[in-house]
């Protein structure tokens, strides 16, 4: 699987999950989150050659098409597969509230 | 929705479904399919700016990150959303067989 275990410990050139830290204030302009100040969101990057973690029958066909037509702009793209939630603390006035923001962290990628 | 109805009738620059015809023999090297000789597979293409058909909470965050950090390589990607099957005819010896190949045609796209 193209997950953090594999991707973070390798020098994989093809589609893989990459490290990305997002600072809520600086990178998103969000002032309302109190904790954490930012988080490891990660992102997906890398080419999707034929047979590389292809998601559907269509992505297999497209990768094969791309192999036969190397100059074509039609190609599968490396996108998130498994996403995880992020617990945050925000304030309503002076009162802290805990919330789970769903689908915030990329754990693995796929070619779609 | 970024579907064929909208995308094929517009000059949309952002993520949208585009026309692509795949010839089974020429483009895939598949000789086993008897009918059709090829099909309109379509593909997804175009940038994913902020608020453009974003798929998950993560893709919203990533697009917003990208807006604040325009030079970053982390950005959502335009990928298939709705896929449809393709009925095909192939031969087993001299006997024709009809099969549905699932997830073969792109009907709409999303930013993931």
């Amino acid at each position: 699987a193209l997950d953090t275990n594999y991707c973070f410990s390798s020098t994989e050139k093809n589609c893989c999950v990459r490290q990305l830290y997002i600072d809520f204030r600086k990178d998103l302009g969000w002032k309302w989150i109190h904790e954490p100040k930012g988080y490891h969101a990660n992102f997906c990057l890398g080419p999707c050659p034929y047979i590389w973690s292809l998601d559907t029958q269509y992505s297999k066909v497209l990768a094969l098409y791309n192999q036969h037509n190397p100059g074509a702009s039609a190609a599968p793209c490396c996108v998130p597969q498994a996403l995880e939630p992020l617990p945050i603390v925000y304030y309503v006035g002076r009162k802290p509230k805990v919330e789970q923001l769903s689908n915030m962290i990329v754990r693995s990628c796929k070619c779609s | 929705a970024l579907d064929t109805n909208y995308c094929f009738s517009s000059t949309e620059k952002n993520c949208c479904v585009r026309q692509l015809y795949i010839d089974f023999r020429k483009d895939l090297g598949w000789k086993w399919i008897h009918e059709p000789k090829g099909y309109h597979a379509n593909f997804c293409l175009g940038p994913c700016p902020y608020i453009w058909s974003l798929d998950t909470q993560y893709s919203k965050v990533l697009a917003l990150y990208n807006q604040h950090n325009p030079g970053a390589s982390a950005a959502p990607c335009c990928v298939p959303q709705a896929l449809e099957p393709l009925p095909i005819v192939y031969y087993v010896g001299r006997k024709p067989k009809v099969e549905q190949l699932s997830n073969m045609i792109v009907r709409s796209c999303k930013c993931s």
């Epitope: 302009g29 309302w32 304030y91 309503v92 923001l101 | 917003l64």
Partner: antibody, heavy 120, light 108 residues
């Protein structure tokens, strides 16, 4: 230029419901918090609730809980306020406003307001 | 909920006079959870002061705010004709946000 434009105000019968819209432009909608405040004719200001558009987290004034629902659509930069079981005392101008960034905060930009009249 | 009591309810002063409006909270707001607004007839409120004493961008320097805890004040150092309006204080320390009942300012 920062702009908030409310719409959907109407004459409604008691017991009815209404959906008001607030369309934002000129700023990064999803980095902000939007509040709704109403003002009955000749009266003061009353905060109803606020929503964080990108995550759809809403906070309401206790007296409106169960009767008001705030939602957001980041694809159209719109916040919606649904108000149900309307009473004559809900007659007011309804404003949406951008906060300075926190859920409860000062509000630096306001819409022009939309008038809701509840009468039989 | 926190009750905000504004005084006076109305005020009539001459041009260039100093204006002071006070706002008392039913419980302590700390030092920074208070704002002041100006509302002219037929218009939406306009933010003047936030954090008890910070002027909003573009607000003239004749407007100022001070205070902490339960007692806050708003001052216009020299009254101008365009300052005729209703002024509101607002607390945002606790939910729900609450406003004072307003002070109507007129020119003699």
């Amino acid at each position: 230029e920062v702009q908030l434009v409310e719409s959907g105000g109407d004459l409604v019968k008691p017991g009815g419901s209404l959906r008001l819209s607030c369309v934002a432009s000129g700023f990064t909608f999803s980095s902000n918090v939007i509040s709704w405040v109403r003002q009955a004719p000749g009266q003061g200001l009353e905060w109803m609730g606020g929503v964080i558009p990108i995550v759809d987290i809403a906070n309401y004034a206790q007296r409106f809980k169960g009767r008001v629902t705030l939602t957001a659509d980041t694809s159209t930069n719109t916040v919606y306020m649904e108000l149900s079981n309307l009473r004559t005392e809900d007659t007011a101008v309804y404003y949406c406003a951008r906060t300075l960034g926190l859920v409860l905060d000062a509000m630096d930009y306001w819409g022009q307001g939309t008038l809701v009249t509840v009468s039989s | 909920e926190i009750v905000m009591t504004q005084s006076p309810a109305s005020l009539s002063l001459s041009q260039e006079e100093k204006v002071t409006i006070t706002c008392r909270a039913s419980q302590s707001l700390g030092s920074s959870y208070l704002a002041w607004y100006q509302q002219k007839p037929g218009q939406a409120p306009k933010l003047l002061i936030y954090g008890a004493s910070s002027r909003a961008p573009g607000v003239p320097s004749r407007f100022s705010g001070s205070g902490s805890g339960t007692d806050f004040s708003f001052t216009i150092s020299s009254l101008e004709p365009e300052d005729v309006a209703v002024y509101y204080c607002q607390q945002y320390a606790d939910s729900p946000i609450t406003f004072g009942q307003g002070t109507k300012l007129e020119i003699k």
